[in-house]
């Protein structure tokens, strides 16, 4: 089978600070040296890119400075963290993995992680 399988958790609950973390694991059919990981958000039938990073195997993955994502990699596993989430960001977050080099190219699409975000209650005014 030439398809690349990507696994990610079905559900994750963001912290009260709007941070959600999940693992994206892929079964590489070949020995890739350069991998691109993209987080996509699917709302209704619309798909948008949340963040993307390319990394060389054995090195850390680096997102752009203004990205809301951070992550670390270990072998065929990527630990992704998305920050600054609010209740309106609740949705399905899909992990996309592309083995860019060496040939052949492979694409892997996860089933998505449903991230639930609950905005914290505002602190009541104190009488002090």
């Amino acid at each position: 089978c030439k398809a690349m399988h990507v696994a990610q958790p079905a559900v994750v609950l963001a912290s009260s600070r709007g941070i959600a973390s999940f693992v994206c694991e892929y079964a590489s059919p070949g020995k890739a040296t350069e991998v691109r990981v993209t987080v996509l958000r699917q709302a209704d039938s619309q798909v948008t890119e949340v963040c993307a990073a390319t990394y060389m195997m054995g090195n850390e993955l680096t997102f752009l400075d203004d990205s809301i994502c951070t992550g670390t990699s270990s072998g065929n596993q990527v630990n992704l963290t998305i920050q600054g989430l609010r209740a309106m960001d609740t949705g399905l977050y899909i992990c996309k993995v592309e083995l860019m080099y060496p040939p052949p190219y492979y694409l892997g699409i996860g089933n998505g992680t449903q991230i639930y975000v609950i905005d914290p209650e505002p602190c009541p005014d104190s009488d002090f």
Epitope: K2, A3, P29, R36, V47, P104, Y106
Partner: antibody
Framework: EVQLVESGGGLVKPGGSLRLSCAAS????????MHWVRQAPGKGLEWVSF????????YYADSVKGRFTISRDNAKNSLYLQMNSLRAEDTAVYYC???????????WGQGTMVTVSS | EIVLTQSPGTLSVSPGERATLSCRAS???????LAWYQQKPGQAPRLLIY???SRATGIPDRFSGSGSGTDFTLTISRLEPEDFAVYYC?????????FGQGTKVEIK
């Protein structure tokens, strides 16, 4: 408007060269992989070439390897296909296509005709 | 290279009837990586179905996709006049990207 517009096709003699261009608009060009696909008269679709987001990685069909070169200029939102040592069997409509976020070719240009004949 | 074989080559159907198109892969294709396109004469292909069964934006629900592994199907439940065209399947999970040879759906 989200669109792709090809140009540069025409009539060329066997052994000649041609450079095709594809102008993208209405979307963040650098966030997508791009492809060239061709269709010979009365025939089916044949994938020709792929280029990665930053242009660092390129793949080619065996039928064009060593003769065609794909490139992109993200600053100009443009995709190119340099075709050298053209043969009669390269005669086709050439389409540029966007590799969608989930993989399929979700946006196509109108195509540009390349005819290789003496 | 994954070879995709479509059948039949030509399908003659009356408007309002159901059309079933087949696409068989030479080796297993993950269902996330199989697409169907429609092409009318003189026009560029248009994405209909991706991920084997998800309809692309703006595609009417009379088009549906199914299948997994090596066998995939595109079904048009009730053919409208504008549906008479050539249909291609494609795998996009690995290079080289490959298309089937196409099925022409013509008016009976």
């Amino acid at each position: 408007e989200v669109q792709l517009v090809e140009s540069g096709g025409g009539l060329v003699k066997p052994g000649g060269s041609l450079r095709l261009s594809c102008a993208a608009s209405g979307f963040t060009f650098s966030s997508y992989t791009m492809h060239w696909v061709r269709q010979a008269p009365g025939k089916g679709l044949e994938w020709v070439s792929f280029i990665s987001y930053d242009g660092n990685h390129k793949y080619y069909a065996d039928s064009v390897k060593g003769r065609f070169t794909i490139s992109r200029d993200n600053a100009k939102n443009s995709l190119y296909l340099q075709m050298n040592s053209l043969r009669a069997e390269d005669t086709a409509v050439y389409y540029c296509a966007r590799g969608g976020l989930l993989g399929p070719f979700d946006l196509w240009g109108q195509g540009t005709m390349v005819t290789v004949s003496s | 290279e994954i070879v995709l074989t479509q059948s039949p080559g030509t399908l003659s159907v009356s408007p309002g009837e159901r059309a079933t198109l087949s696409c068989r892969a030479s080796q297993s294709v993950g269902s996330s990586y199989l697409a169907w396109y429609q092409q009318k004469p003189g026009q560029a292909p248009r994405l209909l179905i991706y991920g084997a069964f998800s309809r692309a934006t703006g595609i009417p629900d009379r088009f549906s996709g199914s299948g997994s592994g090596t066998d995939f199907t595109l079904t048009i439940s009730r053919l409208e006049p504008e549906d008479f065209a050539v249909y291609y399947c494609q795998q996009y999970g690995s290079s080289p990207w490959t298309f089937g040879q196409g099925t022409k759906v013509e008016i009976k």
